[in-house]
């Protein structure tokens, strides 16, 4: 495929990435799948600057990001290293809280109303943010 040079319609460009902000809610897995079908991924936050950009666009609303620990350690959906990377958890989070009574703990990360991160039950229908890099090859065939 060809290299994407500009963002799709209704996506916002920022620092060589394109972002799409949902206005409805989905469970984390459904949000993850939505982004993948758009040749993108749930947002991966790699810096304080990117955190502030996303926070500005989503406002004080719980919003999924591309970070989960459903299979043990915390992992970013694009393979970015979690241990050495940017983090912005709320104090004493993540806590894998079981008190919700829905079974198991909390395995998916979201932006909270103040932008800091929390882990929550992945089935909760939160808004989400998709991200794709401008420099990556798109799946669309090149125009002749």
């Amino acid at each position: 495929g060809s290299e994407r040079t500009c963002c799709p319609v209704n996506w916002v460009e920022h620092e060589r990435s394109c972002y799409w902000f949902s206005r409805s809610g989905k469970a984390w897995a459904d949000a993850d799948n939505y982004c993948r079908l758009e040749d993108a991924h749930l947002v991966v936050v790699t810096s304080w600057e990117e955190q502030k950009f996303v926070q500005h666009h989503i406002g004080p609303v719980n919003t999924w990001m591309g970070l989960h620990d459903q299979n043990g350690p915390w992992k970013w959906v694009d393979g970015t290293d979690y241990e050495t990377g940017f983090k912005n958890w709320r104090p004493e989070q993540p806590d894998d809280w079981y008190g919700h009574g829905l079974g198991g703990g909390e395995d998916c990360a979201h932006f909270t109303d103040d932008g800091r991160w929390n882990d929550d039950v992945c089935q909760r229908p939160y808004r989400w943010v998709c991200e794709t890099e401008l420099d990556k090859a798109s799946q669309e065939p090149p125009l002749l």
Partner: antibody
């Protein structure tokens, strides 16, 4: 290969505090929850509690008032303190790693266990 | 707390036998159920997680089934090294309660 090793006194006097440490090798302590589980001789397994590196803890309600857990990431160790012990706390104490697949937690790596006897 | 019960508490069987152990939860725990084997003087070993998933390195003669409140561990053809106690454990609720165990011994 992840390995866990419990250490601490094998004999504790009644009313005193039991202190154990688990050293993790072959993997980072940062990536998982870590638990303590005990087993009195000839009996079943009892989960004591768990800890995560950011300080989050969960304790068995039946032991909560007496249990404290802590973690030292620089040494790749986590610890258990159980206060006001009685003979009923005599058991083999295991440390274990909490694994997870598809959101379901389980204990996939265990220490070999250390026997703690409470006696004067 | 969620209570876990196991039946039978012990059973006698011969090498080659098909053995079934049952675990019951006091409330629905979906598939948040794990099985362990414990040899004398050793730590428990994870056999099955999430009710039916075989842990890496565990022989395929071990299998698990069930969901909700009723679960089963099956050993399709008992081997000499399988004589040991077996424990179920729930991770639906914090407290991670274990069943009382089922001891499998030689007939």
């Amino acid at each position: 290969q992840v390995q866990l090793q419990e250490s601490g006194p094998g004999l504790v006097k009644p009313s005193e505090t039991l202190s154990l440490t688990c050293t993790v090798s072959g993997g980072s302590i940062s990536s998982h929850f870590w638990s303590w589980i005990r087993q009195p001789a000839g009996k079943g397994l009892e989960w004591i509690g768990r800890i995560y590196i950011r300080g989050s803890t969960n304790y068995n309600p039946s032991l909560k008032s007496r249990v404290t857990m802590s973690v030292d990431t620089s040494k790749n160790q986590f610890s258990l303190k159980l206060s006001s012990v009685t003979a009923a706390d005599t058991a083999v104490y295991y440390c274990a790693r909490e694994g997870k697949t598809g959101g379901v937690s389980y204990f996939d790596y265990w220490g070999q266990g250390t026997l703690v006897t409470v006696s004067s | 707390d969620i209570q876990m019960t196991q039946s039978p508490s012990s059973l006698s069987a011969s090498v080659g036998d098909r053995v079934t152990i049952t675990c019951r939860a006091s409330q629905s725990i979906s598939s948040y159920l794990n099985w362990y084997q414990q040899k004398p003087g050793k730590a428990p070993k994870l056999l099955i997680y999430a009710a039916s998933s075989l842990q890496s390195g565990v022989p395929s003669r071990f299998s698990g089934s069930g969901s909700g409140t009723d679960f089963t561990l099956t050993i399709s053809s008992l081997q000499p090294e399988d004589f040991a106690p077996y424990y179920c454990q729930q991770s639906y609720n914090i407290s991670f309660t274990f069943g009382p165990g089922t001891k499998v011994d030689i007939k």
